[in-house]
């Protein structure tokens, strides 16, 4: 084997010493020396560091601002950041979930293909032939046209992607 060419994985080089990094949840106070060890301190309340590090300051936990429609999905620890999500009826505008927007509704003629979540918007699809949607909704799928035949009725008015068919009684033959 070759001679060593670097400090070990959880170490960093400073002043000819391979010093231990600080563990997640702790920040660096002072580097190690020939006689002293790396000095680390736990992050304070509402702070975190999620990796082995030599940071002198911990990061602040993310604030889930209710004015932006945000709420806490998972409380942060000294080793993890807070995870925000959106209030009911809203979804994140980005992966980082820094703000929220209202779920969009599907217009008449369109139905909901996928209901929105805290992180994704509503996905709409046009109602195909044989289906309709006459409302603007974030939940309603396209409904199938009514089957007049099963009701012993006939189609009096054809359906569209926005309206149902209109059924009526069959014409009676005069004697």
């Amino acid at each position: 084997p070759e001679p060593p060419t670097a400090c070990r994985e959880k170490q960093y080089l400073i002043n000819s010493q391979c010093c231990s990094l600080c563990q997640p949840g702790q920040k660096l106070v002072s580097d190690c020396t020939e006689f002293t060890e790396t000095e680390c301190l736990p992050c304070g309340e509402s702070e975190f560091l999620d990796t082995w590090n030599r940071e002198t300051h911990c990061h602040q936990h993310k604030y889930c601002d209710p004015n932006l429609g945000l709420r806490v999905q998972q409380k942060g620890t000294s080793e993890t950041d807070t995870i925000c999500t959106c209030e009911e009826g809203w979804h994140c505008t980005s992966e980082a979930c820094e703000s929220c927007v209202l779920h969009r509704s599907c217009s008449p003629g369109f139905g909901v293909k996928q209901i929105a979540t805290g992180v994704s918007d509503t996905i709409c699809e046009p109602c195909p032939v044989g289906f309709f949607s006459n409302v603007s909704s974030a939940f309603e799928k396209c409904h199938p046209w009514t089957s007049c035949e099963t009701k012993d009725l006939v189609v009096q008015q054809a359906g569209t992607n926005k309206t149902d068919v209109v059924c009526g009684p069959q014409d009676r033959l005069r004697a």
Epitope: Q17, Q23, E37
Partner: antibody, heavy 125, light 107 residues
Framework: QVQLVQSGAEVKKPGASVKVSCKAS????????MYWLRQAPGQGLEWMGW????????NYAQKFQGRVTMTRDTSISTAFMELSRLRSDDTAVYYC??????????????????WGQGTTVTVSS | DIQMTQSPSSLSASVGDRVTITCRAG??????LNWYQQNPGKAPKVLIH???SLPSGVPSRFSGSGSGTDFSLTISSLQPEDFGTYFC?????????FGGGTKVELK
């Protein structure tokens, strides 16, 4: 201060196993590799292997492969060395020692900068 | 494995004497050599690394030299606390290997 405190002396019969512990204090235990070495009566030092306390990865000397197991418990900052199928020539003082890499004059080298007090293991029928 | 050969295996000396211990590596190890001192019943402690660098706190009467395959440790004026066993160790490759030791006894 940095300290490695080992478990007490053991007397074992041939064929048995022994498990020696090494409790670290005064430094970030997962941050430095731990070596295990032994010294037979009146003999030199013999390296048995190392354990990376962070990952649990090990590297054993060829001579001890299949007989030695090094483990660690990071929650109590303790490394363990178990040697099985003991023979009389395993009678020795067993040491744990912290590996401290340094950089000097443009090259790296590994040093055993802190040692445990040693654990005497006697194998006798 | 790299063979480390130390000589002499033991020596008798008096307080104030100049003492030199040699260590030979079975292959070129550049300057990847550490010296350890071991007092009776105690764990070894680092004396010199690598080859000639003296850690702070180690008395200046100790000195190391050499590179490649031939190394030496010199104690310029032996003191009562210097009696014990001295080991050389190569850190060039795994496994790290040690010399057989040199026991320095009181004459």
């Amino acid at each position: 201060q940095v300290q490695l405190v080992q478990s007490g002396a053991e007397v074992k019969k041939p064929g048995a196993s022994v498990k020696v512990s090494c409790k670290a204090s005064g430094y970030t235990f997962p941050g430095y590799y731990m070596y295990w070495l032994r010294q037979a009566p009146g003999q030199g030092l013999e390296w048995m292997g190392w354990i990376n306390p962070d990952s649990g990865d090990t590297n054993y000397a060829q001579k001890f492969q299949g007989r030695v197991t090094m483990t660690r418990d990071t929650s109590i900052s303790t490394a363990f060395m178990e040697l099985s199928r003991l023979r009389s020539d395993d009678t020795a003082v067993y040491y744990c020692a912290r590996e401290k890499p340094r950089y000097f004059d443009s090259f790296y080298y590994y040093l055993m900068d802190v040692w445990g007090q040693g654990t005497t293991v006697t194998v006798s029928s | 494995d790299i063979q480390m050969t130390q000589s002499p295996s033991s020596l008798s000396a008096s307080v104030g004497d100049r003492v030199t211990i040699t260590c030979r590596a079975g292959q070129n190890i550049a300057r990847h050599l550490n010296w350890y001192q071991q007092n009776p019943g105690k764990a070894p402690k680092v004396l010199i690394h690598p080859a000639s660098s003296l850690p702070s706190g180690v008395p200046s009467r100790f000195s190391g030299s050499g590179s490649g395959t031939d190394f030496s440790l010199t104690i310029s004026s032996l003191q009562p606390e210097d009696f014990g066993t001295y080991f050389c160790q190569q850190s060039y490759s795994t496994p790290p290997t040690f010399g057989g030791g040199t026991k320095v006894e009181l004459k």
